[in-house]
């Protein structure tokens, strides 16, 4: 026997190292994506590594810098926008975040023809939103909750609205609840295709109750932040939609678009606006009880200078088993005849599919079908419809891009992405140029993400835009965990799960188990995507098994699973996590004395309820920024799934589903409760009430607050948070530090 010094064993395993928490917190293994900023059928802009704005022409293969990094730096610009006539660029600086999507900024207009900034009639600051018209170089912007229009960047502004008032009237931008729960944008104004008209929403928050919380800052006295925020059952914003002719804005001024009578008869929401042509617009409305949606197509009446929305152009979408739509009601994609459209909604079997609506919803032609779901319609051209779905190989957590030929009969379907890089890429999105002449595919995993450019006619790959080579090289000596996506069949319910296993996983050994849960309605956690994150580290370095489970209420597997939680939040989501844990124990490699659960936001709610389920399954758990009672959360979101907290509606389940009601059950678990004090979304109130209930029940628990931090717990708080949670879990699992 020859004994060799270990250094001679220069095998792969010896040179490879586990992930560290530092790797995660430093973002060492983050990836890049490439989304072209399309400006025509064959041209796009991209900000180079050295911050020049470069225009690429796919057909000539040429590229040139349209804006130098020197110009960008002169105003500290962090973003830009080219006018469609290519004469001007707006430069955005002094970015100041407000809520999830909204921010204010300072804007400078740069004239490309003379290489100078536009002087005279400069824009005020800070601006809440600014955008170019789709043609030419008109500007619309929102300043102090009012909308302004400029025919040219150097012109004096035309003030469109005058009633804007902080926290009271919002013009062209959403209030808090519309931004977060309905529009998912920072803007609420929409140019018509050729810039003739500008549509905008006005939100009146005068009667909405206000959430107030302290912002401690550095001053002697804390500031109070006040946000009109309708909680479940409270008074909601009143919305009105107006359209103004931007060629002659003072001619008749803003004209209000009528609300369909069946919607206006009680509380309602505006959900989206889609321009069809310059003189046809489509509005979507939703009853406050969110199971009825109306799509209304309106036409400009030149003779009356008004917008007419005939009843014959109203299309009703109703759900009898849950709420309308998925997370949001889907938006229409109009075809070239400017009246018929494609839209995703539930078919008779309860799966979300693409339908073609020509006259009435009842006569809709189903375009896709099967026990899977169409997820997004990217583009409709005269001969093709591009969409994404999770059809391929029956994995709900995948996304592939398909093309349906609508120019021929019968229409033929082709999967564009299914076999491109099959092992590496199973989760795609796409970005199309004008007329879908070209498109970019962005693959998010399960392998290292890659972005590619393709010919819109042949689907041929033209070039790789970003392949994350540096990341690939950096990961070569890292012991990454193994990941598997599988399913459990329990009582006619399919529970898909993702398991993240330590690099040297051995089925004959026992491992601590951490469940990571979100579980909110219409969410999906089990996805075939690449990630090197905190749970990757826990598996790689700390030897934990981590599992994510999509239970009832989650998306893209049909209405039966999705709507199972309707009016009963906090029941089945928790049951299904528990069921999955029991199945994992049966697999034989889980140490049943070391099982934990953690989640953030809705996941914090589910993890709290799971810990307090009285099953004895969980040793410990963490809730970050949890909802604790649905009476504390936003009306638009909560009522969609729970109805109203009134005696004649669903008050009983609102009361039964609180974390506080289960305070006694936390006695036999280790609970770590975490929340930011400046959380505008899930208010600190939620955790304050949990803590109060636990104290009143004389139950011991651990807690951490993050002063002046919002729902995201960003910056240095992130490092502190993950370090703190790591210590907690290692202590819980008796792992040495």
């Amino acid at each position: 026997i020859v004994l060799r010094p270990s250094r001679v064993h220069n095998s792969e395993e010896n040179t490879m190292r586990a992930l560290t928490l530092k790797d995660i917190l430093n973002g060492t293994f983050s990836y890049k994506t490439f989304f072209p900023n399309w400006i025509s059928g064959q041209e796009y802009l991209h900000q180079s590594a050295d911050n020049n704005i470069v225009l690429y022409n796919i057909e000539t293969g040429q590229s040139y810098t349209i804006l130098s990094n020197r110009t960008m730096k002169s105003v500290n610009a962090s973003n830009y926008g080219l006018s469609p006539d290519r004469q001007f660029v707006y430069l955005e600086s002094d970015y100041s975040k407000l809520w999830r999507y909204s921010y204010t900024a300072t804007y400078y207009i740069y004239d490309l023809s003379n290489g100078e900034f536009v002087r005279g009639n400069e824009l005020p600051r800070p601006i809440q939103y600014l955008c170019w018209s789709p043609v030419g170089s008109k500007l619309a912007y929102v300043y102090q909750n009012n909308i302004y229009l400029k025919q040219r960047p150097g012109d004096p502004p035309f003030q469109i609205t005058f009633n804007g008032r902080e926290n009271k009237i919002f013009n062209g931008i959403p209030d808090w609840v519309y931004e977060e729960e309905m529009l998912a944008t920072k803007y609420a104004l929409w140019w018509s295709p050729n810039g003739k008209f500008l549509a905008y929403a006005e939100f009146n928050d005068t009667d909405i109750p206000v959430i107030a919380y302290s912002y401690y800052g550095d001053e002697q006295y804390p500031r109070t932040i006040n946000i009109p925020y309708p909680k479940a059952g409270a008074k909601n914003p009143v919305v009105r939609i107006f359209i103004i002719d931007t060629t002659y804005p003072a001619y008749v001024g803003p004209q209000e678009v009528p609300v369909p009578a069946m919607i206006a008869s009680s509380d309602y929401y505006f959900s989206w606006l889609t321009w069809v042509t310059d003189e046809r617009v489509c509005l979507q409305w939703l009853k406050r009880v969110q199971n009825v949606s109306v799509l209304s197509i309106c036409d400009f009446r030149e003779d009356w200078q008004t917008w007419d929305c005939p009843k014959t152009q109203e299309h009703i979408e109703e759900s009898r088993t849950g709420w309308a739509g998925g997370f949001f009601v889907s938006t229409p994609v109009f075809s070239y005849d400017a009246i018929s459209y494609y839209k995703i909604f539930s078919d008779k079997d309860g799966y979300k599919h693409i339908h073609y609506i020509k006259d009435t919803v009842e006569n809709a032609i189903q375009i896709t079908s099967g026990k899977w779901e169409a997820i997004n319609i990217f583009r409709v051209t005269q001969d093709s419809l591009f969409y994404s779905s999770n059809e391929f190989e029956e994995y709900p957590g995948r996304r592939n891009i398909y093309r349906i030929s609508i120019g021929s009969y019968p229409p033929s379907k082709k999967c564009v992405t299914c076999h491109l890089r099959k092992e590496r890429c199973q989760y795609y999105t796409a970005s199309f140029s004008d007329y879908a002449k070209y498109y970019a595919l962005v693959c998010y995993g399960p392998g290292i993400p890659i972005s590619t450019l393709h010919d819109g006619r042949t689907d041929q790959e033209i070039k790789i835009l970003e392949e994350n080579k540096e990341l690939e090289n950096a990961l070569k000596n890292i012991q990454l965990p193994k990941e598997e996506i599988k399913k459990l069949e329990v009582d006619e319910i399919t529970l898909w799960y993702k398991m993240i296993l330590p690099p040297q996983f051995d089925r004959s050994k026992k491992y601590p188990l951490l469940i990571q849960v979100y579980g909110g309605p219409c969410s999906q956690s089990v996805r075939s995507v690449f990630a090197v994150n905190w749970i990757s580290y826990l598996a790689s370095k700390e030897g934990m098994v981590i599992a994510l489970v999509d239970g009832r209420g989650t998306a893209f597997q049909g209405d039966k699973l999705l709507y199972a939680v309707y009016r009963k939040l906090g029941v089945y989501e928790v049951e299904d996590q528990i069921t999955a844990v029991r199945k994992f124990i049966e697999m034989g490699f889980i140490d049943e004395k070391r099982i934990a659960i953690w989640g953030w936001s809705y996941g914090g709610y589910v993890s709290s309820l799971a810990l307090a389920s009285g099953t004895g399954l969980f040793k410990c758990g963490i809730a970050v920024a949890p909802v604790s009672s649905w009476e504390y959360y936003a009306s638009v979101y909560t009522e969609r799934f729970m109805g109203l907290p009134t005696k004649d509606d669903n008050l009983e389940h609102y009361k039964n589903s609180t974390v506080m009601a289960r305070a006694e059950y936390f006695r036999n678990v280790d609970y770590l409760l975490i929340h930011g004090t400046a959380d505008d979304n899930v208010h600190f109130q939620n955790s304050a009430q949990i803590a109060k209930a636990l104290v009143n029940a004389q139950v011991d628990f651990q807690a951490m607050w993050y002063s002046d931090q919002n729902h995201g717990l960003s910056g240095l708080s992130t490092n502190h948070l993950y370090t703190h949670m790591t210590h907690f879990l290692k202590q819980c699992f008796s792992l040495s530090d």
Partner: nanobody, 125 residues
């Protein structure tokens, strides 16, 4: 009762000027959109100028730079100053008003809510 009474029309030579007035009564003048609209012999209606409640003005290309609309809110009067008149400006000129709708009152039967009787402007040598 809403009343709009135009005056100031007449015969004028090409290149000449005229000033039309419109006295309004029976409604709150300030928050309205006011117009001068004309109808040439055998032709349809054509708007020639507009002024909004904030005093901002609009003109079609055919009269831009020659006509000026203004309002005197204290006197409830609308004016149209017409310079460099041309034979094709010959028409009956009407003063019209459009009242901003209240909440949920979007429906109309025409672009203007009230009209005057009109005043004739003839441009001829």
């Amino acid at each position: 009762e809403v009343q709009l009474v135009e005056s100031g029309g007449g015969l004028v030579q090409p290149g000449g000027s005229l000033r039309l007035s419109c006295a309004a009564s029976g409604f709150t003048f300030t928050p309205t959109y006011m117009y001068w609209v004309r109808q040439a012999p055998g032709k349809g209606l054509e708007w020639v100028s507009a002024i909004d409640p904030y005093g901002r003005t609009e003109y079609p290309d055919s009269v831009k730079g020659r006509f000026t609309i203004s309002r005197d809110n204290a006197k409830n009067t609308l004016y149209l100053q017409m310079n460099s008149l041309r034979p094709e400006d010959t028409a009956v000129y009407y003063c019209a008003v459009r009242v901003p709708p209240g909440v949920y009152t979007y429906y109309r039967t025409g672009p203007y809510d009230y009209w005057g009787q009109g005043t004739l402007v003839t441009v001829s040598s």
